[in-house]
């Protein structure tokens, strides 16, 4: 994302198709209050940012309200009247969906169905990752809606789960961000647990009849 005009690195994140965050890192201007000027596609005049992000007392970014906008953001980062970085970007390329909300687990024998509230826009993947203390790495399953069924689980094992949302690359391109993970929740025998033991508990001895 970051062009290196006059040593300025930028990052754009479009939070949940609601708010655009543009941040900059300009070592040459580290003690300067750079200003951010922008317009959306089709608008004539540039507006100045009204919601700056500050780092060590100096401007380091801007937050813009941009509800479900599928167009180009034109912006200029300036030192006084002098532009130090000017660019235009398709905002949706930098989509970061919000973290899954209202995550629920429905158990039936050796399977669990994980559901959450679908976001209001489409072309997303809802990914569930899970593991037991016996697993060396996370297992993953994803679906187009937040209704993911994982089968073949061992009812005796404790499993940790978390969920996130990703934008489909074919639709939004390769530069999007996955959502933050939901909180980890732990389950064993269909019941929620505070945590899964880090070291696997040895299997119970089978009682001979």
């Amino acid at each position: 994302q970051g062009g290196a005009a006059e040593g300025v690195q930028i990052q754009i994140i479009y939070f949940n198709l609601e708010t655009v965050q543009v941040t900059w890192n300009a070592s040459k201007y580290s003690r300067t209050n750079l200003t951010f000027h922008y317009r959306f596609n089709g608008d004539e005049a540039y507006d100045q940012c009204t919601n700056y992000l500050l780092q060590e007392g100096h401007t380091s970014g801007c937050l813009l309200d941009a509800e479900q906008r599928d167009d180009i953001l034109y912006f200029s980062i300036r030192n006084g009247t002098h532009p130090v970085f000017t660019a235009s970007r398709w905002m949706v390329y930098y989509l970061k969906p919000s973290s899954p909300k209202h995550v629920r687990f429905s158990w039936h024998q050796d399977a669990v169905t994980v559901t959450c509230s679908d976001l209001s826009y489409g072309d997303l993947l809802y990914e569930v990752q899970y593991r037991s203390p016996f697993d060396t790495e996370w297992q993953s399953k994803q679906e187009n809606t937040c209704n993911v069924t994982i089968e073949g689980l061992d009812a005796e094992k404790c499993y940790s789960f978390w969920v996130r949302v990703k934008a489909m690359e074919d639709v939004y391109g390769p530069d999007t961000y996955p959502s933050d993970w939901s909180e980890v929740t732990c389950w064993q025998r269909g019941e929620i647990r505070d945590a899964c033991a880090e070291t696997p508990t040895p299997p119970k001895p089978k009682l001979s009849k």
Epitope: Q1, G3, I72, D123, V171, G173, P174, D175
Partner: antibody, heavy 119, light 106 residues
Framework: EVQLQQSGPELVKPRASVKISCKAS????????IHWVKQSHVKSLEWIGR????????IYNPNFKDKASLTVDKSSSTAFMEVHSLTSEDSAVYYC????????????WGQGTTLTVSS | EIVLTQSPATLSVTPGDSVSLSCRAS??????LHWYHQKSHESPRLLIK???QSISGIPSRFSGSGSGTDFTLSINSVETEDFGMYFC????????FGAGTKLELK
Amino acid sequence: EVQLQQSGPELVKPRASVKISCKASGYSFTGYYIHWVKQSHVKSLEWIGRINPYNGATIYNPNFKDKASLTVDKSSSTAFMEVHSLTSEDSAVYYCARSYGYVNYFDYWGQGTTLTVSS
Amino acid sequence: EIVLTQSPATLSVTPGDSVSLSCRASQSISNNLHWYHQKSHESPRLLIKFGFQSISGIPSRFSGSGSGTDFTLSINSVETEDFGMYFCQQTNSWLTFGAGTKLELK
């Protein structure tokens, strides 16, 4: 089979306007953006803008904002581009093309419409 | 405006040769770079998307590489149907194309 069928060649006088059509078939018209591209010997390929057939929302290349107008007719699955205040510099081949999602690369193109501006 | 510079302007080759075409962006465009082939009196056809991703129905002799500002389209063993113009397109900002590379018969 996906097809974008464009209207035929146009010979138009300077200062007039012209409207070029692009009829889509073989796919859901409202599910893909329609873009317009100008090809001339002077400047190779130039993106003019795009329209969302679902809601008619347009985005233009700033260089063409006052030169072209994009519209659609959903009932006939047809996109239109009107080019205004024609000069000899507008003489070119104009293509419509479609893209899926927000990614803006073109997987299908029309056959092109040749526009000649001459008195 | 992001300017795309293609080189060489013309490439003269014999069928069976392998070639590389260059596209350089005036600023970083991540992987938002796509390649098209246009035969004489025809419409362009998409070859590669996002720098390196293949397109269904496009022969495997076409491949793409690069990221940021420097991109390459490679054709492994050129066939006669490959002659024509090759254009790169960036979609990072409002869309622009390179001036093209003409691949011609030596």
